[in-house]
């Protein structure tokens, strides 16, 4: 359902100071500037909303500008806690303490959070990525050690006045950026405690949060240049379909990746790309400005409406799931990456999907709408959009249901 | 500029294990693939495999995919190849090679001497 | 696993000569071909991609043709430093492959 109730006093409108706030590009993830401690030592910060952690480098790092150091903040406090955290590839681990946080270019606030200093880690920092920490904006269920480590944005919410809401404009450049292009870049917005009229056109759509711990929706419908992919709903959401501004491709599950594959290849026939391309292994290229966006499809993922039945579709272009990538070797092309991938954990919608669009997470109304972006890539022919009411029934089915793991399953 | 920088010769005994490193420099190290390629003494180029060093996912040649072993460490930039039960048909001079379109970088090479 | 057939396995010729290596697949490839140079005691030297591009700082007397099941690599007019063995390889699909090589000697 479009987005047409009252004006609500600081959920909409104009937050000039907010606009702009994020730099980076897609492959290396999005940052805002925070200030962290008392005197305030100031570091870029990778807005994630994959992940419930609000953590730090605070120990030297090769790929690390600057780090936290805590002995140097008269507000740190210790909590006496250690934290580690596995990835599937790489870690970080750290200790955990609260200090006072403020967002430069956010709201004019200062909260007492929790950090987790790392002072350790394997694949997690990137080198040249420019930022030194992670704000994990989404629940309390998937932080770590436990759920009981209040999440920043739930500080945030708890101790001032700011509307439980953020929105996010990632703006994908659409060419390759040098480093010293990136730091003069502007990246997008992170609106926290409101929506900007500015940052989008057309309406937004709403989709239910289906469960508070990623930001968890419902895919209910997959087209490939308006072909079904005819998949049952439920493959498209296995285990889960979440919202992540810290992934950069769009990860789709394996039978729904080989299946779009399939079909994006179809579309795309009139040139042979190798099979490295499709593993995202391989780059093509195009002589500079004539890459033919037209031969390949637009994908449209329908996702479950606010209203019984009823659904609408947000589709991206090739401009967004093609990524450009420098490489000195062929400068004289525009070359891409294929920047969607396989997934063993359920459909990631990464940076890929969202510089598409303007996202709204709603955490008060347990809902993440959807418009189309002012900042997003596209040509004189197509654009992203984001289009509804769609009839579609016994959309509760599509969601999957990971099995329990807890005791009390353990028990039976 | 790209470079890629591959440890010494080795040389090693009929059953034994050799690891060569391949440390690469001047790009974004996660945004590539790495291969390895292998040349035996005045033979051509065989293909063995790719790792890609942003998440560690690997592919291999089906002929060395039970002994080869390819391996990232992202925080020195250094992709790792281990070669197991070695024979002496595997003496060969083995390369790094970086992914973009085809391998527009290739590493010095490191010659794998296999003699009991 | 796609075969990739050079021709001729070697060849002699002078400075100044057009040089012509072929080099046929058992299968389509598509463009997705390169082509690489080669001296004794190095590593190779990437000349070619898709078929027909020449990757940056490669001389233009270096050129590439061809798509489907068979390429060409010419070299419009040799030179002292292009004595070399020359490789063909498919990266269309896995496991990649390479020519046997095309050894360009001194006449």
């Known amino acids: 359902e479009t987005d047409e109730e009252p004006e609500e006093p600081g959920r909409r409108g104009s937050f000039v100071e907010m606009v702009d706030n994020l730099r980076g590009k897609s492959g290396q993830g999005y940052y805002v500037e925070m200030t962290v401690g008392s005197p305030p030592q100031t570091l870029n910060i990778l807005v994630d909303t994959g992940s419930s952690n609000f953590a730090v480098g605070a120990a030297p790092h090769p790929f690390l500008h600057r780090y936290y150091q805590r002995q140097l903040s008269s507000t740190y406090r210790d909590l006496r806690k250690g934290v580690y955290v596995p990835y599937t590839q790489g870690k970080w681990e750290g200790e955990l303490g609260t200090d006072l946080v403020s967002i430069p270019h956010g709201p004019n606030v200062t909260v007492r959070a929790n950090i987790a200093a790392i002072t350790e880690s394997d694949k997690f920092f990137i080198n040249g990525s420019n930022w030194e920490g992670i704000l994990g904006l989404a629940y309390a269920e998937i932080a770590r050690p436990d759920d009981s480590l209040e999440p920043f944005f739930d500080s945030l919410v708890k101790q001032t006045h700011v509307p439980n809401l953020f929105s996010l404009q990632l703006c994908g450049a659409g060419f390759p950026l040098n480093q010293s292009e990136v730091l003069a870049s502007v990246g997008g917005s992170m609106i926290i405690g409101g929506i900007d009229h500015s940052l989008y056109t057309g309406s937004l759509w709403y989709t239910p949060i289906r469960r508070e711990w990623y930001y968890e929706v419902i895919i209910v419908r997959v087209e490939i240049n308006g072909q079904d992919l005819k998949m049952d709903c439920k493959e498209y959401n296995y285990d889960k379909s979440i919202v992540d501004s810290g992934t950069t491709n769009l990860r789709l599950p394996k039978k729904v990746f080989e299946a779009a594959v399939k079909s994006i290849k179809a579309a795309s026939s009139t040139e042979k790309f190798p099979d490295g391309f499709w593993l995202g292994e391989q780059l093509v290229c195009w002589q500079a400005g004539t890459t033919p966006w037209n031969i390949f499809p637009v994908i449209s993922l329908y996702l479950m409406g606010e209203v019984t039945n009823q659904s609408f579709r947000i589709t991206i272009l090739p401009q967004q799931y093609l990524r450009p990538v420098e490489d000195v070797a062929t400068s004289q092309d525009d070359c891409y990456k294929f920047a969607i991938s396989q997934s063993s954990t359920g459909t990631v919608m990464g940076a890929v999907i969202m510089e598409g669009f303007y996202v709204v997470f709603d955490r008060a109304r347990k809902r993440i709408g959807f418009a189309v972006s002012a900042c997003h890539v596209h040509d004189e022919f197509r654009t992203a959009a984001v289009e509804g009411p769609f009839v579609t029934l016994d959309m509760e089915d599509c969601g999957y249901n990971i099995p329990q793991t807890d005791e009390s399953t353990l028990m039976t | 500029q790209v470079q890629l920088v591959q440890s010494g010769a080795e040389v090693k005994k009929p059953g034994a294990s050799v690891k060569v490193s391949c440390k690469a420099s001047g790009y974004t190290f996660t945004n590539f693939w790495i291969h390895w390629v292998r040349q035996a003494p005045g033979q051509g180029l065989e293909w063995m495999g790719m790792i890609d060093p942003s998440d560690s996912y690997t592919k291999y040649n089906q002929k060395f995919k039970a002994r080869a072993t390819l391996t990232v460490d992202t925080s020195t930039s250094t992709v790792y190849m281990e070669l197991s039960s070695l024979r002496s048909e595997d003496t060969a001079v083995y390369y790094c090679?970086?992914?973009?379109?085809?391998?527009?970088?290739w590493g010095q090479g490191t010659l794998v001497t296999v003699s009991s | 696993d796609i075969q990739m057939t050079q021709s001729p396995s070697s060849l002699s010729a002078s400075v100044g000569d057009r040089v012509t290596i072929t080099c046929k697949a058992s299968?389509?490839?598509?463009?997705?071909v390169a082509w690489y140079q080669q001296k004794p005691g190095k590593a190779p030297k990437s000349l070619i991609y898709?078929?027909?591009h020449r990757y940056s700082g490669v001389p233009s007397r270096f050129s590439g043709s061809g798509s489907g099941t068979d390429f060409t690599l010419t070299i419009s007019s040799l030179q002292p430093e292009d004595f070399a063995t020359y490789y063909c390889q498919q990266y269309n699909s896995y496991p990649y492959t390479f020519g046997q090589g095309t050894k360009v000697e001194i006449k």
């Open positions: 299968q389509d490839v598509g463009r997705n």
């Open positions: 898709s078929a027909s």
């Open positions: 090679a970086r992914s973009g379109v085809a391998f527009p970088y």
